[in-house]
């Protein structure tokens, strides 16, 4: 039985050209996290974090994606095209798969709303 829940940063906004941290946290389960996958709105893989082996960033995003903090992901040099949904998929044993959703809005304006506590100015 899957008892866990994923907490995410929810809906966040950030400035064009700036950076933002995407964070998910799995709670209420003793399941072992084996891998976390991060995907973009069109289900493009951004990165994989394997519990034993570490991080791999997908080659196409190498210049703009940085691992961490923790199991999170940092998106850099944001463009308007980065607006959309992001998904963290937690592969766990023995529970199975948990999925969290974050919506990122990239703002043109010089002052973006600071709506997320994980955001980098």
């Amino acid at each position: 039985m899957m008892t866990g829940t994923i907490e995410t940063t929810g809906n966040i906004s950030a400035k064009k050209g700036g950076s933002v941290i995407l964070q998910c946290h799995l709670s209420s389960t003793m399941a072992q996290v084996t891998q976390v996958n991060w995907e973009q709105h069109d289900h493009s893989l951004l990165a994989i974090r394997n519990a034993e082996l570490g991080w791999h960033i997908y080659p196409a995003f190498k210049d703009r994606v940085a691992p961490g903090p923790g199991l999170g992901l940092t998106l850099q040099s944001l463009t308007m095209n980065d607006t959309g949904e992001y998904f963290c998929t937690y592969h766990t044993y023995p529970d199975g798969t948990y999925r969290g959703r974050i919506f990122l809005e990239v703002l043109e304006s010089s002052v973006a709303e600071h709506s997320a506590r994980f955001q980098i100015p």
């Epitope: 069109d42 289900h43 994989i48 196409a60």
Partner: antibody
Framework: EVKLVESGGALVQPGGSLKLSCAAS????????MYWVRQTPEKRLEWVAS????????YYPDTLKGRFTISRDNAKNTLYLQMSRLKSEDTDMYYC????????????WGQGTSVTVSS | DIVMTQSHKFMSTSVGDRVTITCKAS??????VAWYQQKPGQSPKLLIY???ARHTGVPDRFTGSGSGTDFTLTISNVQSEDLADYFC?????????FGVGTKLELK
Amino acid sequence: EVKLVESGGALVQPGGSLKLSCAASGFTFSDYYMYWVRQTPEKRLEWVASITKGGGSTYYPDTLKGRFTISRDNAKNTLYLQMSRLKSEDTDMYYCARQSSYDFVMDYWGQGTSVTVSS
Amino acid sequence: DIVMTQSHKFMSTSVGDRVTITCKASQDVDTAVAWYQQKPGQSPKLLIYWASARHTGVPDRFTGSGSGTDFTLTISNVQSEDLADYFCQQYSNYPLTFGVGTKLELK
């Protein structure tokens, strides 16, 4: 059992076009990135193209961009490679491959289909 | 482009031996390296990913190691069915690139 079966390889004249297909079975096709890789007669392997699960993003080496197009039909569990303006150096064995769910590597490959470009 | 150099195109071995195949990347690729085995008339098969993780069903006599620019594939207690071509591949950066291969043959 994961199965990838390529087809469409043929003898084609320089400047011609060809469309390769790869029929996938034994797994949920729409859950995986897919690749085309080619192998020269001297056995050198060269990455040709990659495509995301839904087909929204495609990637190619600069040397092939514009001539080759990767696409997929998830309803038909089929991967395609459209090749145009073919050159003699495109003479190769073409393999389709599936990306692993554990990492960005090709965990299963088809048996290949042979393309010969010659006049 | 990142060049993957397999300096030995051929390596001779005997059944029961231990053999080490090397691969060098022209720049740092962290641990984003895979090893494939290809037997005559067959397609490549994944052996190792993440530089050291064995793919499902791969015998434990195959061991991958390395990070950065230097990588090795070690086959301990070589069996006759291991005689094949071995290719390394980096997937740290586009374009994805492969080594030219090392052919493992009997002495």
